[in-house]
Every structure is written in structure tokens, then in C-alpha cells.
């Protein structure tokens, strides 16, 4: 019993004065405890406690169940134990099968004895199969078996608590061990889709699946910049051992446009924690923006290839697509096709192929989109370059030489003299009058332009070239002069062409 | 054949009460500390109580703590959860399992757990 200098508390003292008591299952249980300032017995088995007011704890029958740590404590909260057994041959242990341990800790299988002096109290495994190599345990006869730093690997190990007892092992009920794994990576948290885009009163709904060893990892759906508890629902499965997957599901029934933003989904486990983003844009209705790949204003030269292409945005998807020349709708020179396969695309692209154009074929080519909220349209202007074509080159009654031209852009007329028969004409002569013509072809066609010299001022035999040429190329006339005496004879026109 | 089986569950307005039963048999009864669980639609696996061996020893969710009382009787093999005070939050199926781990996690689950009684609080 303790000894405490006088005048200070002291604990209280037990009876019998032993720190172990072994009885006999049968026998009587006699406790005593003396203290002036007696409060309450204590005993404790396996998590349990029960309590007696009395001093005197009694147990007329012991049975093996009674085995535990009997505490008496005073006013004062000091406290004196003792500890018995309830030696039961047919029961050797008190169990409690719960056994759960978390990778790395220690835990603790409860199959406290009823004998303490039976021998080779250890672990065994079920059926004969032997324990993890690594496993190491601490023996206690009041509390149990400690296994020592739980490994993963011992998830749903089957023991047994084990004695000798005259010479025979005898084993506990059977223990499964549920290893509660400890986190060593953050989680993997993904989302089902990147960005959303919405009309108003569409639901949004999105799912962000978390993986990680267990089903302790904390996850939640925030709105980023709010504080506002968003409504989320779970699903989760365990996918065999330490393999947990939760799928968290966060909806709005009807979107409006102030609940466009970032929705984070955030998970965190003891190691760390991770997250993954989600944009919401809502509109009240849908739009259509058209983006031209290239100049609206297109030039191209005669009989060359030339494509249009357009890419454009359209939510919701497009419905109706449609290239239009001259009132007329292309059946096929064109194709429309998605800018991506991702599942949120809105970008498009249009192409119309047109080959070999001719002359006749500028003018305004539209692009037509339609979805079921709004229309949109863009026109290209194309331009198709031709050399010049010599349409008219005649002597007028007044005696004027006159060249009328055709081509795009605007030809050019150029008047020269050959005299002779020299093949080279390289006196220029100035035209007296220079006229662009109206065109009576579409507006995008040839621009005609005519031409005129006097042909008085030839005194000579000889050639007048009429030269017309623009970018692409020239073509050119010729007036033929013959004098007899004073007299002009007949002029002969005709033309080469230039290459 | 280990078999838990709950009764008790039902239809219950907000503020009433009603005392769940888990009969145990197939397995030594008092060699397990045992446990409530239950889950709400749509909801993980929760917590609920937990008693000891011989029922010295009693643990709750804060979520029920002094509204629901554990208990057992060992000799009836027997399980039972007086629920008070119910909330519509409280609806969910309810489970009788083998073990209880302190951390509340039941990673790995349980040696043995019931199919569960229906309790569904609603005015």
C-alpha cells in the first residue's frame, strides 16, 4: 500500500493489498476500500466501465467476465487499483472482435486473459496460414496484443489470439484485421467537363469524381468568390482495396446568367489537398459570331481556284448553313464541318470551293447560319482579274480611231504609230479622248474603256497599234494605212493578240 | 449462417420517436462490440452509434448525440437504438453491423452488417 508524509491526501488503500488478484471461476470476489473521503468503484474491461457506490465491491459468483482492473477512487481523485483474473478453463480470453488499425499506427486486438499464467500468449493466423513475415506484436495479458505499425498488407488478415495451456494451444475467436490506410498523396480529383455553356433557364449540371485510398478524403463543390453552401449529390465506390472513387454531383435546375462563374470542385485528405475548375456561362439566348479567315474583298485571276472560308461560333448548334450566289444556292462546292470533337465545342467552319473561275463569275457570295435563336450572314466580294479583250476597234465617219477594251481591273489604252513596214510601233501617240464605260454585266465584271486618236495626224504609210493591258496581261489592234497620191486609202484593222 | 436482421423502421412526423431492433444470430453475439449505421438517399455510408461488448460502454455521432440511446441484451442477442426528437435530416436506412472503430471510418467495413429498416421522417 502507498505511504504519504501526514497531512497530505493520500490514495486510497485496497484489500486485499496486492496489485493482482487470481480467483476461481465460482469463487467470491471481496474488494475493500478504505478512505474517509470514499467516493465510487470503477471497473474497466475491454472499453467497458462500470461503477459501485459502495466501498465494499462484492461478486458473490465470478464468472470470467468479471476479470478486469477494479479502481477505487476518492474525493480527492486519487485513485488506487488492483487487477483480477477469473480463472475460466473454458473461457481463456475476454474478446472483442472489433479490430481496426490505421497503416503505420500500432492497434490493439483485445483478447485480454482470464489466466495469467498460461504461456506463449501470441498471435497465430487462421487456418494454419502463417503471420506476415514483418509483423511484430507486444503481448499484454491485461489489454491484449499489440501489433506494432500496421501495414497496408494486412488489410483483412484472419487471427487468432493464442495460449498454452497444459500443454495444448488454445485459440481465441477469429479476428479480421480492416486497415484504414493512411494518405500519401494528395487526391485525384477530374472533372466531366472543363466549361459549360448555357440559356438561361437550362440546367447545369456537373460531376467531379475524387479517387483516393479511402473513403475519409473531405470533398466539396465551392463557387469561387462565395461562401454560399452549394447542393451537391454522391455517389462512391470502393473498387477493391484502398481504391475509392466518389462522384460528387453539383446542379442548378434553372441556370440563370448571374450563376455564370468558376465552380471549384476541392478535395483534401491528411496529406494535401487538390482541386479542379469548371466555367459556367450563361446567356439569356443564343448568338451566332461569324469570323472571316480571309479579306472579304477577294481578288483572283482568271481561271485560277480561290477558297472562302469562314469559321464561326454558334450556340446552340447550328441548324442551317448555306453559301448564295446571285440568288442561287450552292448544292455543292462547300463543306461545314465542327472546329473540334470536343463535346463543348461552338466553333465551326464553312468552306466554299470555287475553281477555274471565269470572268463572269465575280459578285457577292453570302454565307448563311441559322440556329433556333438567332440568323447570321457575311458577304465576300470577289473580284475575278482578266486581261484586256479589244471588244470594238473601228475608223469613225468623223475619222477618229476609236479602241473600245474590256477587262478588270480597269484596262489601260495605249496608241502607237508604226511607220512603213516596221514591226516595232514605239512613237506613242496621245489619245484624244479617254471614257470609262458602264458596264451593262454585273457589277463586279469587266470595266470597259474606250479610246480615240485622230487618224488626220498620219501622213504616212503605216501601222496605229491600239494597246490595251491591265495587270494580268495586254492584247492589242492594228489600223493599216496606205496613201495614193493624197489620198487615204481604206484602213484595215486587225487585231494580235498578246500573250 | 450469420444474420442481422432490423425491424422498427417506418413513417414518423419531425419531433417523434421510434426504437429500433437488430436480432443477432450465426455468431457469438457478445464478442463484438456493434454498431449503428445508416445512409440517406444518395449519401455515403454514416455513423451513427456504437455500444461495447456488454454495453458498459456507449458512443453517438454528434449529429444524435442526446436524442438517440444504444443498448443490447446479451442474452436475447439483441441490438436496439431508442431514436427521439427525429428530424427529416434523420431520414435514411438504418444497419445493424459487428465492430466498432473509433475513428468512425470503418475503412474495409464490417465483419457482418444487416440489409437495413427504412426510417423515413417527413410531416
Known amino acids: 500500500q502507498p505511504s504519504v508524509s501526514p497531512g497530505e491526501p493520500s490514495p486510497p488503500s485496497i484489500h486485499p493489498g496486492k496489485s493482482d488478484l487470481i480467483v476461481r471461476v465460482g469463487d467470491e470476489i471481496r474488494l475493500l476500500c478504505t478512505d474517509p473521503g470514499f467516493v465510487k468503484w470503477t471497473f474497466e474491461i475491454l472499453d467497458e466501465t462500470n461503477e459501485n457506490k459502495q466501498n465494499e465491491w462484492i461478486t458473490e459468483k465470478a464468472e470470467a467476465t468479471n476479470t478486469g482492473k477494479y479502481t477505487c477512487t476518492n474525493k480527492h481523485g486519487l485513485s488506487n487499483s488492483i487487477y483480477v483474473f477469473v480463472r475460466d478453463p473454458a473461457k481463456l480470453f475476454l474478446v472483442d472482435r472489433s479490430l481496426y488499425g490505421k497503416e503505420d499506427n500500432d492497434t490493439l486486438v483485445r483478447c485480454p486473459l482470464t489466466d495469467p499464467e498460461v504461456t506463449n500468449y501470441s498471435l497465430k493466423g487462421c487456418q494454419g496460414k502463417p503471420l506476415p513475415k514483418d509483423l511484430r506484436f507486444i503481448p499484454d495479458p491485461k489489454a491484449g496484443i499489440m501489433i506494432k505499425s500496421v501495414k497496408r498488407a494486412y488489410h483483412r488478415l484472419c487471427l487468432h489470439c493464442s495460449v498454452d495451456q497444459e500443454g495444448k494451444s488454445v485459440l481465441s475467436e477469429k479476428f479480421i484485421l480492416k486497415v484504414r490506410p493512411a494518405f500519401k498523396a494528395v487526391p485525384v480529383v477530374s472533372v466531366s467537363k472543363a466549361s459549360y455553356l448555357l440559356r438561361e433557364g437550362e440546367e447545369f449540371t456537373v460531376t467531379c469524381t475524387i479517387k483516393d485510398v479511402s473513403s475519409s478524403v473531405y470533398s466539396t463543390w465551392k463557387r469561387e468568390n462565395s461562401q454560399t453552401k452549394l447542393q451537391e449529390k454522391y455517389n462512391s465506390w470502393h473498387h477493391g482495396d484502398f481504391n475509392y472513387e466518389r462522384q460528387a454531383t453539383l446542379t442548378i435546375s434553372s441556370a440563370r446568367v448571374n450563376d455564370s462563374g468558376v465552380f471549384m470542385c476541392y478535395a483534401n485528405n491528411t496529406f494535401g489537398s487538390a482541386n479542379v475548375t469548371t466555367t459556367l456561362e450563361v446567356v439569356d439566348k443564343g448568338f451566332i459570331n461569324i469570323f472571316p479567315m480571309i479579306n472579304t474583298t477577294v481578288f483572283v485571276n482568271d481561271g485560277e481556284n480561290v477558297d472562302l472560308i469562314v469559321e464561326y461560333e454558334a450556340f446552340p448548334k447550328p441548324e442551317h448553313q448555306q453559301w448564295i450566289y446571285m440568288n442561287r444556292t450552292f448544292t455543292d462546292k462547300w463543306e461545314d464541318y465542327p472546329k473540334s470533337e470536343n463535346e463543348s465545342n461552338i466553333r465551326y467552319v464553312s468552306e466554299l470551293h470555287l475553281t477555274r473561275l471565269k470572268g463572269t463569275e465575280g459578285g457577292t457570295y453570302t454565307f448563311l447560319v441559322s440556329n433556333s435563336d438567332v440568323n447570321a450572314a457575311i458577304a465576300f466580294n470577289v473580284y475575278v482579274n482578266t486581261k484586256p479583250e479589244i471588244l470594238t476597234y473601228d475608223r469613225l465617219v468623223n475619222g477618229m480611231l476609236q479602241c473600245v477594251a474590256a477587262g478588270f481591273p480597269e484596262p489601260t489604252i495605249d496608241w502607237y504609230f508604226c511607220p512603213g513596214t516596221e514591226q516595232r510601233c514605239s512613237a506613242s501617240v496621245l489619245p484624244v479622248d479617254v471614257q470609262t464605260l458602264n458596264s451593262s454585266g454585273p457589277p463586279f465584271g469587266k470595266l470597259v474603256v474606250q479610246s480615240s486618236i485622230d487618224s488626220s495626224a498620219f501622213k504616212h504609210n503605216g501601222t496605229v497599234e491600239c494597246k490595251a493591258y491591265n495587270d494580268v496581261g495586254k492584247t492589242s489592234a492594228y489600223f493599216n494605212f496606205a496613201f495614193k497620191g493624197n489620198n487615204k486609202e481604206q484602213i484595215h484593222p486587225h487585231t494580235l493578240f498578246t500573250p | 449462417e450469420v444474420q442481422l436482421l432490423e425491424s422498427g423502421g417506418g413513417l414518423v412526423q419531425p419531433g417523434g420517436s421510434l426504437r429500433l431492433s437488430c436480432a443477432a444470430s450465426?455468431?457469438?453475439?457478445?464478442?463484438?462490440?456493434m454498431s449503428w449505421v445508416r445512409q440517406a438517399p444518395g449519401k455515403g455510408l454514416e455513423w451513427v452509434s456504437a455500444?461495447?461488448?456488454?454495453?458498459?460502454?456507449?458512443y453517438y455521432a454528434d449529429s444524435v448525440k442526446g436524442r438517440f440511446t444504444i443498448s443490447r441484451d446479451n442474452s436475447k442477442n439483441t441490438l436496439y437504438l431508442q431514436m427521439n426528437s427525429l428530424r427529416a435530416e434523420d431520414t435514411a436506412v438504418y444497419s445493424c453491423a459487428t465492430g466498432y472503430d473509433p475513428s468512425g471510418h470503418y475503412y474495409g467495413g464490417f465483419d457482418y452488417r444487416g440489409q437495413g429498416t427504412l426510417v423515413t421522417v417527413s410531416s
Open positions: 455500444i461495447s461488448v456488454r454495453g458498459g460502454s456507449t
Open positions: 450465426g455468431f457469438t453475439f457478445d464478442s463484438y462490440a
